[in-house]
């Protein structure tokens, strides 16, 4: 009889341990959920405030059609410029058409005047071909005027209404580009 009671007691104790474990797991799960909830709420808040502003481009960016452009206020070499754009979820400007080139040069005239701005164009050291950063070739009307006689890597930049080339290690302003947010309305 005593053995039976002690077996029951052990079973009860085991059950209690399991319940305690379950409770601990539940508490942990609840805490995790609360954290996730906080995170989601913060994300929603950001999304809502962005939606409330309903601007397809971030502050200080310029919109044209499906693109947003950022004209830097600092100088950097071409590679650093690219990284600065990536930090903002963008890449160096890739000019797809004469219309886009005209918009960019027109905007620059209004903003800053005649400075040099890196764009996402570089010359392959082996083949000498000009390529945009995504690997595509520029259209014939958008090839840089031959200007750089550099033995180093050569990159493209915009000045006034021209596309020119220069040693990638020189310091210039730069232009970033990202897609404009589509309005879901």
């Amino acid at each position: 009889k005593l053995l039976q009671v002690s077996t029951i007691a052990m079973q009860q104790q085991e059950k209690l341990i399991q319940q305690e474990r379950a409770l601990l797991n539940f508490t942990e799960w609840k805490r995790s959920c609360a954290l996730q909830m906080k995170y989601c709420q913060a994300f929603m808040q950001n999304s809502l405030s962005s939606a409330h502003n309903s601007s397809p481009c971030p502050n200080n960016w310029i919109q044209n059609r499906e693109s947003c452009y950022y004209v830097s206020e600092i100088w950097s070499i071409w590679h650093t410029s690219q990284e600065n754009c990536l930090k903002e979820g963008s890449t160096l400007l890739q000019i797809e058409s004469k219309e886009e080139m005209d918009f960019i040069t027109g905007s620059l005239r209004k903003i800053k005047g005649s400075y040099d701005y890196w764009v996402g164009l570089s010359q392959d050291g082996h083949s000498g071909r000009w390529l945009w950063q995504d690997g595509s070739s520029p259209s014939p009307g958008l090839l840089p005027a031959e200007r750089s006689q550099s033995a180093n890597q050569v990159c493209g930049y915009v000045k006034s209404n021209s596309l020119l080339s220069s040693n990638c290690s020189t310091w210039k302003y730069f232009i970033c580009e990202k897609y404009a947010l589509r309005s879901s309305v």
Epitope: F43, L86, K87, E88, G89, T91, K178, Y179
Partner: nanobody, 115 residues
Framework: QVQLQESGGGLVQAGGSLRLSCAAS????????MGWYRPALGNQRELVAA???????TYVDSVKGRFTISRDNAKNTVYLQMNSLKPEDTAVYWC?????????WGQGTQVTVSS
């Protein structure tokens, strides 16, 4: 904080292919772009390829047409598909997450291309 875990490196013959993966965890909502780097001259790291959240890509000249960067948002993972590999592609490849305030690096994965 953002944690990055690379995988997919290994030994391959020249002309072969490899696919590197970089899985991100932690504060992933702060990530704006992700990229792959490898060593360059003078103890620097060069950006091999990168992809922004909206899918824009950038590649270093030497890999254009051979490497392709892509992302799977559901898995918070970025991939680097490396085709037509050359012995000069041999290197440690690091994954990097770009946020507005800070950059995060993975531990790196070794790629060796034998001739």
């Amino acid at each position: 904080q953002v944690q990055l875990q690379e995988s997919g490196g290994g030994l391959v013959q020249a002309g072969g292919s490899l696919r590197l993966s970089c899985a991100a965890s932690g504060s992933i909502l702060s990530i704006n772009s992700m990229g792959w780097y490898r060593p360059a001259l003078g103890n620097q790291r060069e950006l091999v390829a990168a992809i922004t959240n909206d899918g824009r890509t950038t590649y270093v000249d030497s890999v254009k047409g051979r490497f392709t960067i892509s992302r799977d948002n559901a898995k918070n993972t970025v991939y680097l598909q490396m085709n037509s590999l050359k012995p000069e592609d041999t290197a440690v490849y690091w994954c990097k997450a770009f946020t507005r305030d800070k950059d995060y690096w993975g531990q790196g994965t070794q790629v060796t291309v034998s001739s």
